[in-house]
């Protein structure tokens, strides 16, 4: 299944190499001089970078049920405080990633940083769980929200059949995969448009909300810090929900090698995005509270809908469309970024060789994109996705914390390393502690689910020894792997990146 990061297991040049004319050549073909290399291009500009980050952070949650924070704070004032604090802490994590991304100029995000600092085993475990469970399940969940909301205007007076939701979801997933397979530029352009839609939707909520405040609709802010059940013991859970809502700031680091002028673009994109998202989230919540009281917000499964029904009149009919577009943006951004994680992991020998190959004409990591399709479809038509993600939510913070701790380690181990962007040490230190705290909180608040998550994650250890370390694989297995790889190369028209040949 997986090779070690060396040349072919049978013979040198055991894979097919491409030429610039977009054909898989017979051996000995000479490449015409001055032609474009088959490799991923630096097409992610500052605007595209910002749209990737914002587009993947803002999903459907802020429109549907931003109640996890309020539920565990018990008061409007405290919930707004937590939203702000989580935004600042996420910015700290993002700044730490900005340093990592400009120091280690490779795509792959936390996988790459963990690999560089802590070695192959923890890095492999990370990508193993991401590929087999987290990413397919997460994509299926956000895609189901897309499916539900895109169909909603057509089923105003009756329930939407579950099968219809799943089928339209499957279409949505396929469109995202095709888009990301066909063109980096187009998926980035669409991401910019979808991010613009998201921000428009948020402004549509914020502006009337602020107008309500100006009109004196402040009843829900009176005694803002007194509320029912505002127990200090539940604040950590509120914090957990808040941090989860901001998760996604790390996605630009998955595509570092495709970022134009990464030393400048990555830190700038991260800072701009986090500022916009934090201000957007806090003001959206403020807007909600001008029209919906705390009890109603906790009850509702469609906060933006209730809000817009009351303040926007007929425009509320557009809310489901905006939510659907927001979900689609998250799907697109997530697939765009995470496919690069699989691409890099394959290049490092941690995933099948085919996943590190690039389409000869379109210059997209086609196999790394489409590998998600069947896995996501399996998730979509089976099992309890929410439970799966609950089991593994701790893993995200564990590995991100590990990556940021790696930054601190590198500061001491390699003090002379070139660091175009450098953050004060207290920032990664505080953020690493935050991640540690969140893993501990998972264990404390739900030891059963977290325990299952740990077990699932640890399946990566035997897998590592079986697929990566074990050299003496049977000859038939190696020959079959080669044949499958070559066949897929021909079908998909993909070759290894030229710099890596």
């Amino acid at each position: 299944m997986v090779r070690k990061p060396v040349v072919s297991t049978i013979s040198k040049g055991g894979y097919l190499q491409g030429n610039v004319n977009g054909r898989l050549p017979s051996l000995g073909n000479k490449e015409p001089p001055g032609q474009e290399k088959v490799q991923l291009k630096r097409k992610v500009t500052l605007l595209r970078g910002v749209s990737i980050i914002i587009g993947t952070i803002i999903g459907a949650g802020i429109f549907i049920s931003p109640k996890g924070v309020l539920q565990n704070t018990g008061s409007v004032g405290m919930s707004l405080t937590i939203w702000t604090v989580c935004g600042v802490l996420s910015l700290f994590g993002a700044l730490s990633y900005a340093e990592l991304g400009t120091t280690i100029k490779k795509s792959g995000g936390h996988y790459t940083y963990i690999l560089e600092v802590f070695g192959p085993l923890p890095a492999f475990v990370r990508v193993w769980v991401e590929l087999l469970i987290i990413r397919p399940a997460a994509t299926a969940v956000i895609s189901l929200a897309f499916g539900r909301y895109i169909l909603e205007p057509f089923f105003i007076q009756c329930e939407i059949p579950e099968l219809a939701i799943k089928l339209i979801t499957a279409v949505g997933i396929t469109v995202v995969m095709v888009l990301n397979s066909m063109s980096v530029s187009w998926s980035a352009r669409i991401q910019i448009f979808l991010t613009f839609c998201k921000l428009t939707a948020i402004l549509i909520i914020i502006v009337p909300g602020v107008m309500q405040l100006i009109k004196g609709q402040t009843q829900n802010f009176k005694d803002a810090f007194s509320g029912r059940d505002s127990s200090i013991t539940r604040l950590p859970l509120a914090f957990y929900y808040g941090m989860y809502a901001y998760a996604g700031w790390f996605y630009l680091n998955f595509v570092t090698e495709e970022v134009e002028n990464p030393e400048k673009t990555i830190p700038l994109a991260i800072c701009i995005s986090m500022a916009i998202v934090t201000i957007g989230y806090v003001l959206t919540n403020v807007a909600y509270f001008t029209t919906i009281n705390a009890e109603e917000l906790l009850l509702s499964n469609a906060v933006a809908v209730t809000f817009s029904e009351r303040l926007l009149g007929n425009f509320s009919l557009a809310v489901p469309i905006f939510v659907a577009l927001s979900c689609f943006g998250s799907m697109n951004g997530g697939v765009f970024a995470v496919s690069r994680l699989f691409y890099v992991a394959s290049r490092e020998g941690h995933l099948p060789e085919i996943l590190s190959m690039i389409h000869v004409r379109k210059h997209t990591p086609l196999p790394a994109v489409i590998v998600l399709h069947p896995l996501t479809m399996i998730m979509l038509f089976s099992g309890d996705l929410d439970s799966l993600l609950n089991f593994l939510s701790f893993a995200r913070w564990l590995f991100i914390g590990l990556a940021v701790a790696g930054l601190i380690y590198l500061r001491y181990k390699c003090p002379d390393m070139h660091r175009p962007f450098k953050v004060p040490l207290f920032i990664p230190a505080l953020f690493s502690f935050t991640c540690l705290f969140m893993v501990a909180l998972s264990l404390y608040s739900d030891p059963f689910s977290t325990g299952i998550g740990f077990v699932i994650t640890l399946t990566g250890v035997p897998a590592y020894y079986l697929f990566i370390i074990w050299d003496k694989k049977p000859r038939w297995f190696r020959i079959m792997s080669e044949k499958i790889t070559r066949t897929l190369q021909i079908i998909l028209e993909v070759v290894p990146e030229e710099d890596k040949l």
Partner: antibody, heavy 121, light 106 residues
Framework: QVQLQQSGAELVRPGASVKLSCKAL????????MHWVKQTPVHGLEWIGA????????AYNQKFKGKATLTADKSSSTAYMELSSLTSEDSAVYYC??????????????WGQGTTLTVSS | QIVLTQSPAIMSASPGEKVTISCSAS?????MYWYQQKPGSSPKPWIY???NLASGVPARFSGSGSGTSYSLTISSMEAEDAATYYC?????????FGAGTKLELK
Amino acid sequence: QVQLQQSGAELVRPGASVKLSCKALGYTFTDYEMHWVKQTPVHGLEWIGAIHPGSGGTAYNQKFKGKATLTADKSSSTAYMELSSLTSEDSAVYYCTRPLYYRYPYYFDYWGQGTTLTVSS
Amino acid sequence: QIVLTQSPAIMSASPGEKVTISCSASSSVSYMYWYQQKPGSSPKPWIYRTSNLASGVPARFSGSGSGTSYSLTISSMEAEDAATYYCQQYHSYPLTFGAGTKLELK
């Protein structure tokens, strides 16, 4: 199809408490809020409050805070409303009701058959 | 809270007659919702978002209005329309119902 089955009529003494039930059939119980409405000849229909069985979130009409307590049991897909310190004013027909869809969270498409509560000594 | 005042409280109409039931809100609301209830039965959803008929509601029914003034109209009264009609708002918390208009057949 969607059905809301309410418990039978109750005759209770003043000062006592009563727990009315509403069993949900034909849909995923945890996906929708369950609301409770009181009906009397004098006051007509009055919204008491609601519970979201999925999250456990509740909302009450200020008038009924302290009087009604809403709970839900996911395992049996049943919503409950407990009324305490009963007086003759609490004699009424009580309905559980469910919104059609999230877009109209307070537009009630499905109603139980109603439970008649009589408070009398 | 927003108070909804329905008028008239009781009215009777002959078959074929046009009927209008009014609902006035104590402050402006975005939409009005209407329910029909017959004796011994639970209320039924009748009109949503001011003017949209719920499924199964005959086309002779219509709803209109904005701000604080809303109405339900039956273009041609039929025997089966005899019932009590309630208006409802959820523009402001808590949601409230009107006291009802009892429509009888003459």
